[in-house]
């Protein structure tokens, strides 16, 4: 059976967008009016891992596009790539574990855990305009809550 | 053509047992994460239970956590659910559903699902 997936954008709980940065990076930043069409469409699929009532395995993929978040260790530390992967043989129901994210859900808001680093988030700053990332600390200065806004396919 | 067909509903007192079944045809059964949902008399379509392909994994609301038990024998392309402990809350019908993936807390979404089999606790 092919996975599942639905498209949909995520914003932070400041309301910031999503939007590519150069071809393997994505930034966070306020849009309003036509420029919210440069916001990043995702791919979520529904995949295997530890699901409870709360979380939900998901791997995040670009729409129409070869590119999936990861999770890797760049220099010890677990570090938020975009990984270029096969058309061919993805998005796929067993994903290898740096691409899962736990998705959770609490009151109302997601966070994304990194299945490959527990306790790491994609992460963005308070900061206009800076990269999105993978942060070991909630409920700091860096923001983990995000909505998910659903996209007709 | 899928088909999906429930049985196994009744009347029971609380705290009784009930195992409900679905025969499955018109695809590759073990292919399919399976699950079951319900519906309460005047209320919307609640998520029950799902099984994996392979019936390795098995995730419950935390309604029925502890008191149902999903599973599967692909060889009879069949589904079940073992319901025990019964509650009046538990009251509704209950329909099968194919390629059952939960993508919200209480949404989840489905490609086929049966005409349902209608459980009634009650003294």
């Known amino acids: 059976a092919p996975v599942r997936s639905l498209n949909c954008t995520l914003r932070d709980s400041q309301q910031k967008s999503l939007v590519m940065s150069g071809p393997y990076e994505l930034k966070a930043l306020h849009l309003q009016g036509q420029d919210m069409e440069q916001q990043v469409v995702f791919s979520m699929s529904f995949v295997q891992g530890e699901e409870s009532n709360d979380k939900i395995p998901v791997a995040l993929g670009l729409k129409e596009k070869n590119l999936y978040l990861s999770c890797v260790l760049k220099d010890d530390k677990p570090t938020l790539q975009l990984e270029s992967v096969d058309p061919k043989n993805y998005p796929k129901k067993k994903m290898e574990k740096r691409f899962v994210f736990n998705k959770i859900e609490i009151n109302n808001k997601l966070e994304f855990e990194s299945a490959q680093f527990p306790n790491w988030y994609i992460s963005t700053s308070q900061a206009e305009n800076m990269p999105v990332f993978l942060g070991g600390t909630k409920g700091g200065q860096d923001i983990t809550d995000f909505t998910m806004q659903f996209v007709s396919s | 053509e899928v088909q999906l067909l429930e049985s196994g509903g009744g009347l029971v007192q609380p705290g009784g047992s009930l195992r409900l079944s679905c025969a499955a045809s018109?695809?590759?059964?073990?292919?399919?994460?399976m699950g079951w949902v319900r519906q309460a008399p005047g209320k919307g379509l609640e998520w029950v239970s799902s099984i994996s392909a392979m019936g390795n994994r098995t995730y419950y609301a935390d309604s029925v956590k502890g008191r149902f038990t999903i599973s599967r024998d692909d060889s009879k392309n069949t589904l079940y659910l073992q319901m025990n402990s019964l509650r009046a809350e538990d009251t509704a019908v209950y329909y099968c559903?194919?390629?059952?993936?939960?993508?919200?807390?209480?949404?989840?979404?489905?490609?086929?699902w049966g005409q349902g089999t209608l459980v009634t606790v009650s003294s």
């Open positions: 018109g695809f590759t059964f073990e292919d399919y994460q």
């Open positions: 559903a194919q390629n059952l993936v939960r993508y919200m807390k209480s949404q989840w979404m489905f490609d086929y």
